[in-house]
Amino acid sequence: QFPRQCATVEALRSGMCCPDLSPVSGPGTDRCGSSSGRGRCEAVTADSRPHSPQYPHDGRDDREVWPLRFFNRTCHCNGNFSGHNCGTCRPGWRGAACDQRVLIVRRNLLDLSKEEKNHFVRALDMAKRTTHPLFVIATRRSEEILGPDGNTPQFENISIYNYFVWTHYYSVKKTFLGVGQESFGEVDFSHEGPAFLTWHRYHLLRLEKDMQEMLQEPSFSLPYWNFATGKNVCDICTDDLMGSRSNFDSTLISPNSVFSQWRVVCDSLEDYDTLGTLCNSTEDGPIRRNPAGNVARPMVQRLPEPQDVAQCLEVGLFDTPPFYSNSTNSFRNTVEGYSDPTGKYDPAVRSLHNLAHLFLNGTGGQTHLSPNDPIFVLLHTFTDAVFDEWLRRYNADISTFPLENAPIGHNRQYNMVPFWPPVTNTEMFVTAPDNLGYTYEIQWPSREFSVPE
């Protein structure tokens, strides 16, 4: 959401979020690292192009023209400098002058050594328990952000991992239309549209960077779960990894796993939608997970096949009208899982990414809650690996990523909600090894062609 330094009455009233980097002669003397030439405080650029008509409530949601409902000035960083105050480096760069290239490797979780697996699990658990050093979350909408007295900013601290959950929740929540009115649910700033892949890419990149900084380990990388096994078992659901099934309750995680101790955030949907409050940092019940356990829906009891990945990578157009969950011949809609793996839309189909979520049959299968199950991270790194392979094969052809008339939040130049500092979809539509400082260690299945007899 926003840097702690900007969650103040002064910053919110002024609309300026340009924190100092190294103020030598008092507050406001080194905004955005300006004294060392790292950046400057500038007007926010926000996409004002039209969105599709399925969202008819313009003016009612803080996420419109993000982040202008809160701030209209932010740091613009020079060169490879980046961050809320230009104090860090753009992805793929490190060093005091952000002039050293870095490339980290995201690997298959199952290929890691015992120590590496343990390291990853412990790092996730540390992220769940460590307060985010930079960001705080809003617990009220902009009209109530200064509290009942108009002088008390409504923000809370949150852990690094719960911040990851909260940002996802905030991007998918309904539009509150007022007490006594039903909230509007046909809105999603991170799914069912072209921004699905770019949004989740940045989401992971932010978590990875936060964990690198928490550990002070620049080479730390998020592994992936190759969920395209065609199996009806979760191969990473073991106690040394993401947790096996509890013997006492088949919908819970084994007490031998640290994840059985995790408690979820953002589960009070009823309150958010009727009272207009936002998810806060309060933790509730345990993670629910019952892989392959949805007997009422046999189609989600088995994971995608390896060939589904090979097929989806042959869909050459990134997206197609109406740029929604009913698009046909859209790579994005195919990997998201609303089309079959060949790209054909079918309302009954749930494939690839969607199928993997639904297979988990619990917390991980509910959009507003799904990142609470840490398998979400691994599921999305694999999805991002597929995206990166598509970008490599098709030279990051952005021509079918619409500049306008996509669902709200999904235009090419829209600032992805609720990330800070503002970052557009375009900035994530690039090959990761050359532009974002990470690569995947992965072998892609080649498509098998049946030879006629």
């Epitope: 343990n118 928490m214 380990e217």
Partner: antibody, heavy 119, light 107 residues
Amino acid sequence: QVQLVQSGSELKKPGASVKISCKASGYTFTSYAMNWVRQAPGQGLECMGWINTNTGNPTYAQGFTGRFVFSMDTSVSTAYLQISSLKAEDTAIYYCAPRYSSSWYLDYWGQGTLVTVSS
Amino acid sequence: EIVLTQSPATLSLSPGERATLSCRASQSVSSYLAWYQQKPGQAPRLLIYDASNRATGIPARFSGSGSGTDFTITISSLEPEDFAVYYCQQRSNWLYTFGQGTKLEIK
């Protein structure tokens, strides 16, 4: 070049406290975690834990909780190790070492600070 | 917790001879193992990292090998300045574990 200069030897009585310093230069202090390693006389190396020099968050190894405190002052690029209620068995050389080139090993070390606890 | 066991505890050799020091981990540490040299009154000095890579400025006579649980550091032809204590080290949950050391002494 990377340099770590530790404070001088200390002779303390049991029950007293000691605070040793480790001043870093030649790199951005807040970019790399600082580790503390203990070596009792004639013994091997023992990792005590580390401090995140960006956030100040310490992590202590088993056996080093309670009487041992890691702290820092970023304005002077210095990490500190404080030991309270000193015991004879705390007599050792204490080293600081940043996780510099890689988080998996330690390629730069301070020269060590000898703390002697004796009545 | 992973335990590193070094052998032998003491190795007596003459200058010019070949020295082979071993380190065994109680469970696999992949190739994340380092070797350090420590001389009396000095801080440890990194020799080998990631099991087989020589650190900056380390002479070619030092080499490391192994992966998983069994590791070796070899000094092809001992020089007088090589007589010291050698430690292997691995990392677990951001904390470093060292072997008990091998003392390489002049015969």
